[in-house]
Interface confidence: low
């Protein structure tokens, strides 16, 4: 497998609305035109796929309509946003990048971004 370095932040704190954003940057060994980005979540030694998108360089990332992820790309950087997070979703989110075209195929997996999600305190009942 052709290895490729992928960098991502170590820690990100989700907003009170359950939104977390981070940058996934890859060191492209060549001139990729088609890139696949996958976000994996690792928790309790279990790894699950959160979302994935394939995009052509210069175009927008397109996740599935029901995906909790959105993103934009710029050069060798992908700005990823994960929405709808709750405290139970806290975990290590790993960015996996594949250079699909042109050959040779390259695969890079980041060390992961620990996303902390804190559920907001419920608003106290107000008497008016």
């Amino acid at each position: 497998c052709k290895a490729m370095h992928v960098a991502q932040p170590a820690v990100v704190l989700a907003s009170s609305r359950g939104i977390a954003s981070f940058v996934c940057e890859y060191a492209s060994p060549g001139k990729a035109t088609e890139v696949r980005v996958t976000v994996l979540r690792q928790a309790d030694s279990q790894v699950t796929e959160v979302c994935a998108a394939t995009y052509m360089m210069g175009n927008e990332l397109t996740f599935l309509d029901d995906s909790i992820c959105t993103g934009t790309s710029s050069g060798n950087q992908v700005n990823l946003t994960i929405q709808g997070l709750r405290a139970m979703d806290t975990g290590l989110y790993i960015c996996k990048v594949e250079l699909m075209y042109p050959p040779p195929y390259y695969l890079g997996i980041g060390n992961g971004t620990q996303i902390y999600v804190i559920d907001p305190e419920p608003c106290p009942d107000s008497d008016f």
Partner: antibody, heavy 120, light 107 residues
Framework: EVQLVQSGAVVAKPGSSVKVSCKAS????????MNWVRQAPGQGLEWMGM????????SLNQAFKDRVTITADKSTSTAYMELSSLTSEDTAVYYC?????????????WGQGTTVTVSS | DIQMTQSPSSLSASVGDRVTITCRPS??????LAWYQQKPGKAPKLLLY???NLADGVPSRFSGSGSGTDYTLTISSLQPEDFATYYC?????????FGQGTKLEIK
């Protein structure tokens, strides 16, 4: 219909060069890699290199890198392979072959082949 | 470079027989392997890609299997038009090397 039409048979002298052409039609020439593969009489297939016509980026088999030049002319949708310093061992059929755009890759269309005979 | 060891180099079989050809690359190909059929005086024709995917227009009697460093092309019931030479090819980084070929002959 995708077609790759190659130039005709050539007889060349040892030490000389030969240039084979491959005219593509029926698809967008600039979005696929074009490969060159040769086959010596009674032998197997040997990949020589490829070119991406959009910007003429090439990837060559190191076994040929000092002798082979692969070029592409976008205006005529034609790829070329030139092999220099010919010896009798270069006598072979030379094929161009288009490579699919997505992983997994494969050579989906091939030219009819050009016979190159090196003889004094 | 990745070396492709294809076996057998030749094979005699009869119409209706089940035939298996193997290809063993020198390193893991992650299924980036294609199979081609070539008849005398003709260009190779794509049969399978990605180790298991049947190319357009190829009869279903052809199938591929394998992963890692062990791949197989199977013809479930040989037809007269299947007698030809078969090549495997890796597409896992350049150079894209081919196996030495398997010549399938009529018994």
């Amino acid at each position: 219909e995708v077609q790759l039409v190659q130039s005709g048979a050539v007889v060349a002298k040892p030490g000389s060069s030969v240039k084979v052409s491959c005219k593509a039609s029926g698809y967008s020439f600039t979005t696929y890699w074009m490969n060159w593969v040769r086959q010596a009489p009674g032998q197997g297939l040997e990949w020589m290199g490829m070119i991406h016509p959009s910007d003429s980026e090439t990837s060559l088999n190191q076994a040929f890198k000092d002798r082979v030049t692969i070029t592409a002319d976008k205006s005529t949708s034609t790829a070329y392979m030139e092999l220099s310093s010919l010896t009798s061992e270069d006598t072979a059929v030379y094929y161009c072959a288009r490579m699919g755009r997505r992983n997994p890759y494969y050579f989906d269309y091939w030219g009819q082949g050009t016979t190159v005979t090196v003889s004094s | 470079d990745i070396q492709m060891t294809q076996s057998p180099s030749s094979l005699s079989a009869s119409v209706g027989d089940r035939v298996t050809i193997t290809c063993r690359p020198s390193e893991n190909l992650y299924t980036n392997l294609a199979w081609y059929q070539q008849k005398p005086g003709k260009a190779p024709k794509l049969l399978l890609y990605g180790a298991t995917n049947l190319a357009d227009g190829v009869p279903s009697r052809f199938s591929g299997s394998g992963s890692g460093t062990d791949y197989t092309l199977t013809i479930s019931s040989l037809q007269p038009e299947d007698f030809a030479t078969y090549y495997c090819q890796h597409l896992w980084g350049t150079p894209f090397t081919f196996g030495q070929g398997t010549k399938l002959e009529i018994k």
